[in-house]
């Protein structure tokens, strides 16, 4: 990720290409207080009845270049005995995020905004039961 220095001259918002060409300062300010982030759970992935694993999705031509993605460990959920419950399904919870993708044919500091669907965790849902009519 490359930090683009902010210009002292503000662009003209009236300009036709204003929304197509915006300078972004990529300096990340951690807005989460330490209390909030210390409560952020890292063990739910194992304690959940629909446990998941995390993989480090790397794309050097994307900002951020590292995104941690969840995958459900099982198709079914885990019951209190630690066995798979065939009446319950593990499903991935996905979130749509915006990322910046480098435009390779242009200079390394040119990016375009793209949507990306990221798995953030798994939850347990009851299986759909289809009754014979």
């Amino acid at each position: 990720a490359v930090l683009i220095p902010q210009s002292s001259v503000c662009p003209n918002a009236e300009a036709n290409n204003f929304l197509q060409n915006v300078k972004v300062n990529l300096k990340v300010i951690n807005s989460l207080s330490s209390k909030a982030s210390s409560r952020r759970p890292s063990d739910y992935l194992n304690r959940s009845t629909s446990p998941w694993t995390l993989s480090r999705n790397e794309d050097p031509d994307r900002y951020p270049s590292v995104i941690w993605e969840a995958q459900c460990r099982h198709q079914r959920c885990v019951n209190a005995e630690g066995k798979l419950d065939h009446h319950m399904n593990s499903v991935l919870i996905q979130q749509e995020i915006l990322v910046l993708k480098r435009e390779p044919e242009k200079c390394p500091f040119t990016f375009r905004v793209e949507k990306m669907l990221v798995g953030v965790g798994c939850t347990c849902v009851s299986s759909i039961v289809r009754h014979a009519s």
Epitope: A1, V2, L3, L26, V28, N30, L32, S34, S37, S38, R40, S42, D43, L45, N46, L54, S55, R56, E58, P60, D61, Y63, P64, S65, V66, W68, P108
Partner: antibody
Framework: EVQLVQSGAEVKKPGASVKVSCKAS????????FHWVRQAPGQGLEWIGV????????AYNQNFRDRATLTADKSTSTAYMELSSLRSEDTAVYYC????????????WGQGTLVTVSS | DIQMTQSPSSLSASVGDRVTITCKAS??????VGWFQQKPGKSPKLLIY???NRYTGVPSRFSGSGSGTDFTFTISSLQPEDFATYFC?????????FGQGTKLEIK
């Protein structure tokens, strides 16, 4: 002030396991990745793997996937690297280092832990 | 894995000299290269990130350049405290890899 303080030197027998700790202070532990790197005597640096204390995710260098285990304890802001089935070639200084995921570089390093594997 | 080939492996120079170390990646790593200084018994210290950006507090005599596969690290005027080993490193894709190091010695 950001500090990464590692546990002391260890001497182990071949086949044994070692667990090295790295205690972080001066910043929010769950915000950044922890990477582990080793340096054999007179050699270059070799990347072992990464853990993100915020979500518990891990990734490993293929060369260490079967023997290394990375964990983190949020209550004590400590990251751990366990290496099993030790052999003499594992004699090295092991470093923990903080990786700024968004900015994309290693900024702070622990002081290193020397692990000697000898029969 | 991406190989980082660093040269020279050792270098003798005098205080005030200009010194250049090169690093060649086995494939393009864009600008995702860092340079580290390491003194005996100490941990590596970040000097340059993203090929050419000086890290906070690093003196201006240290500089870096390059992109793609070829990278250069320069010390414009050697100071007594600069005699150490220098490593390049790529964080373009894991497993992250390092050059073998250049030992800078007093002539």
């Amino acid at each position: 002030e950001v500090q990464l303080v590692q546990s002391g030197a260890e001497v182990k027998k071949p086949g044994a396991s070692v667990k090295v700790s790295c205690k972080a202070s001066g910043y929010t532990f769950t915000d950044y990745e922890f990477h582990w790197v080793r340096q054999a005597p007179g050699q270059g640096l070799e990347w072992i793997g990464v853990i993100h204390p915020g979500n518990g995710g891990t990734a490993y260098n293929q060369n260490f996937r079967d023997r290394a285990t990375l964990t983190a304890d949020k209550s004590t802001s400590t990251a751990y690297m366990e290496l099993s089935s030790l052999r003499s070639e594992d004699t090295a200084v092991y470093y923990c280092t903080r990786f700024l995921t968004y900015e994309g570089y290693f900024d702070y390093w622990g002081q290193g832990t020397l692990v000697t594997v000898s029969s | 894995d991406i190989q980082m080939t660093q040269s020279p492996s050792s270098l003798s120079a005098s205080v005030g000299d200009r010194v250049t170390i090169t690093c060649k990646a086995s494939q393009s790593v864009s600008i995702d290269v860092g340079w580290f200084q390491q003194k005996p018994g100490k941990s590596p210290k970040l000097l340059i990130y993203h090929a050419s950006n000086r890290y906070t507090g690093v003196p201006s005599r240290f500089s870096g350049s390059g992109s793609g596969t070829d990278f250069t690290f320069t010390i414009s005027s050697l100071q007594p405290e600069d005699f150490a080993t220098y490593f390049c490193q790529q964080d373009y894709s894991s497993p992250y890899t390092f050059g073998q190091g250049t030992k800078l010695e007093i002539k």
